[in-house]
């Protein structure tokens, strides 16, 4: 570590005095100190001498000697006071810049340590400090305003009491900068824009930050637009707004618009798309199949997506039959807006009844005209079965009628004993009817089929059962021949009640 002579921490001299500061180290040594006049520097190997034969108040400050070759970076320091009765302060800076909540050192160096008891910090023109200004003083370094606030950005003077009167330093400007958390916040409105050629349009790009030093621009398809900027300050934020007004849009105005803002922390950008169209449009679509099949008693939501410009002037859901003239309840119709030009309309059909099968149409209107999208709703039913004994062309025949949707399949079973339903152990014979006769098949209705089983002789201690099934469920009917004629048994658990 270098050694300074005189070997005292501080030295007090009068103006005009000769001062010699000598530093000696193992290798070459160097001096650093405040900017001040009249010093002469002599270097000779491992020693360096700072000297002046005319010390002034401006030489007041801390002089540090370092040894550049020292890997430990050791240094020695001495503080020099040049006590000028007319100049109690040596101010080392015109301006101090700190961030909010940092300590701000105002470098007024006291030229005479005796004056320390009567020092104070004031704002220029003798104004008192703002309330809650917390500061401390060091004769070597000056006044420190602790945890400086933006509002404390002022011009300050250091004051010392000399012979009963206050003597001020030259002023120091304090600039307290707000801490910038990141790039400016951005908004670009609208998020999407559609206009018909010839209409007017407005796009607004705005950025805000706690600090005024930021830039914002609007670009169209990577071309920066020259737009006058409006500036404002509110809610403790600086705001810069760029407004693009287009009186009559044309196709060349269409495309991507980006709002870009940057500051020392970085850059933010956000984009929107502007579409220019020849005329009004109205498009209806659905992600669902337009032909729907639902089991009776269950619910269904019909959804339509609408893309339109200009906005809709009217819309509604309509039931087109064929079962009744009822219309969907308005409370079951719901509209949600995805964005300015896209909407979703939903019709909720809970616990569907047979009379609610049929066509449902969504109609919408805007200046571009009417559009409709129609759903066809068919209900699914489990089969209902009935069996009768009859003679056809002189032959005894069991006739099974099955009704349901989708079209039921028919299977005949013959089993021993009298039973409501044949079980596996009892089955004597099974006949599948791959092509039962379709008796009725109208849209949105059940399909009724008929299957014939010709029986030469009815066995009296046996049961004949007709079973029908489809994707929804199954139904059956047992026919038991008895001596007094024929007897039929629907199943105990009747599967369906219309």
């Amino acid at each position: 570590i270098p050694v300074i002579e005189p070997s005292v921490p501080e030295l007090v001299v009068k103006p005009g005095a000769t001062v010699t500061l000598r530093c000696v180290g193992n290798g070459s040594v160097e001096w650093d100190g405040p900017p001040s006049p009249h010093w002469t520097l002599y270097s000779d190997g491992s020693s360096s001498i700072l000297s002046t034969n005319n010390a002034t108040f401006q030489n007041t400050g801390t002089y540090r000697c370092t040894e550049p070759g020292d890997p430990l970076g050791g240094s020695a320091a001495i503080h020099l006071y040049v006590k000028d009765p007319a100049r109690p302060w040596n101010v080392l800076a015109q301006e101090v810049v700190v961030f909010e909540d940092q300590d701000a050192l105002l470098p007024c160096l006291l030229t005479d340590p005796v004056l320390e008891a009567g020092v104070s910090l004031v704002r220029v023109r003798g104004r008192p400090l703002m309330r809650h200004t917390n500061y401390s003083f060091s004769p070597w370094h000056g006044f420190t305003i602790h945890r400086a606030k933006f509002i404390q950005s002022q011009d300050y003077q250091c004051s010392a009491l000399m012979g009963g009167r206050k003597v001020m330093s030259i002023s120091i400007r304090l600039k307290v900068q707000k801490v910038i958390p990141g790039p400016p916040a951005l908004t670009l409105v609208p998020a999407e824009l559609v206009r018909i050629r010839g209409e007017a349009a407005q796009i607004v790009c705005s950025a805000s930050s706690v600090d005024v030093n930021f830039d914002v621009f609007l670009q169209h398809n990577n071309t920066k637009l020259a737009i006058p900027q409006q500036s404002d300050f509110h809610n403790n934020r600086y705001q810069k707004v760029l407004t693009l007004n287009l009186d009559q849009v044309d196709f060349q105005h269409a495309g991507n618009y980006s709002c870009v803002a940057s500051n020392v922390q970085g850059k933010h950008s956000t984009s929107m798309f502007f579409r220019v169209v020849e005329s009004a449009y109205l498009n209806l679509s659905s992600e669902q199949n337009l032909i729907q099949e639902v089991t009776v008693g269950e619910g269904l939501n019909l959804k339509v997506m609408v893309e339109a410009y200009p906005g809709l002037q009217g819309f509604n859901w309509t039931y087109l039959g064929p079962f009744s003239d009822h219309q969907p309840e308005p409370k079951l119709a719901n509209a949600t807006t995805k964005d300015t030009y896209r909407h979703t309309f939903t019709l909720s059909l809970p616990r569907l009844k047979p009379s609610e099968a049929g066509r449902y149409s969504f109609l919408a209107r805007n200046p571009g005209g009417w559009r409709a999208l129609t759903f066809e709703l068919t209900l699914r039913y489990p089969p209902e079965v009935s069996v009768i004994w009859t003679f056809i062309n002189g032959s005894g025949t069991l006739l099974c009628a099955a009704s349901g949707y989708p079209q039921p399949n028919v299977t005949w079973l013959q089993c021993s004993g009298h039973t409501d339903r044949c079980d596996e152990a009892q089955v004597l014979q099974v006949w599948d009817d791959p092509y039962p006769e379709v008796l009725s098949q109208e849209p949105f209705h059940k399909v009724t089929v008929q299957s014939l089983l010709t029986v030469e002789t009815l066995e009296h201690n046996q049961t004949y059962e007709c079973r029908a099934h489809n994707s929804v469920g199954s139904g059956s009917w047992a026919f038991i021949p008895i001596s007094a004629g024929a007897h039929t048994h629907p199943p105990d658990e009747f599967l369906f009640t219309p």
């Epitope: 650093d32 100190g33 405040p34 900017p35 001040s36 006049p37 080392l92 301006e95 810049v97 940092q102």
Partner: antibody, heavy 116, light 108 residues
Framework: QVQLQESGPGLVKPSETLSLTCTVS????????WSWIRQPPGKGLEWIGY??????TKNPSLKSRVTISVDTSKNQFSLKLSSVTAADTAVYYC???????????WGQGTTVTVSS | EIVLTQSPGTLSLSPGERATLSCRAS???????LAWYQQKPGQAPRLLIY???SRATGIPDRFSGSGSGTDFTLTISRLEPEDFAVYYC?????????FGQGTKLEIK
Amino acid sequence: QVQLQESGPGLVKPSETLSLTCTVSGGSISSYYWSWIRQPPGKGLEWIGYIYYSGSTKNPSLKSRVTISVDTSKNQFSLKLSSVTAADTAVYYCARWRTFYGMDVWGQGTTVTVSS
Amino acid sequence: EIVLTQSPGTLSLSPGERATLSCRASQSISSSYLAWYQQKPGQAPRLLIYGASSRATGIPDRFSGSGSGTDFTLTISRLEPEDFAVYYCQQYGSSPYTFGQGTKLEIK
């Protein structure tokens, strides 16, 4: 071995603010005075100002437009020059300034053009 | 502010010759606060001399400085090819710290 590196945008629009940063490596920013100097194309050197800790002194010809600040946590100091015009087009240098030795370490310089 | 005037504006010499560059101040300055810098095209200035006469670290001894008050001189005793550049004097004793307009040393 102290080294300096300037950084910042190479193009600034008239009336906007020029912002440059000088990153100090190989030494503590708290130990010395640090300066900004500029050199217009084909011309001489002009001293802009210096900073020590957070206190700065500036060239009166630029004083009202210049802010010099320091960020000790990043070992950086910065220059802001507001309301720029074409006359502010120059190579901007940062340098270490020592009161008895002059400007002994310089950055390589960064070119700033003021143009719309 | 202190104005520094350098002369000549351009100096044309051959390698091996002696170069003498002058710097005159508009008012007296302490010799402790005068520096000389060398600048080559596309490069930052480099400190040659501080305190009017002390060589900076790594500067060859063919470079020397002298003077006091208002007149200062940079001398290059024997020009090497790498010495052809622009030279600036600067005073750093009184704010604003000013530079001379430069002397261009070119090969004859």
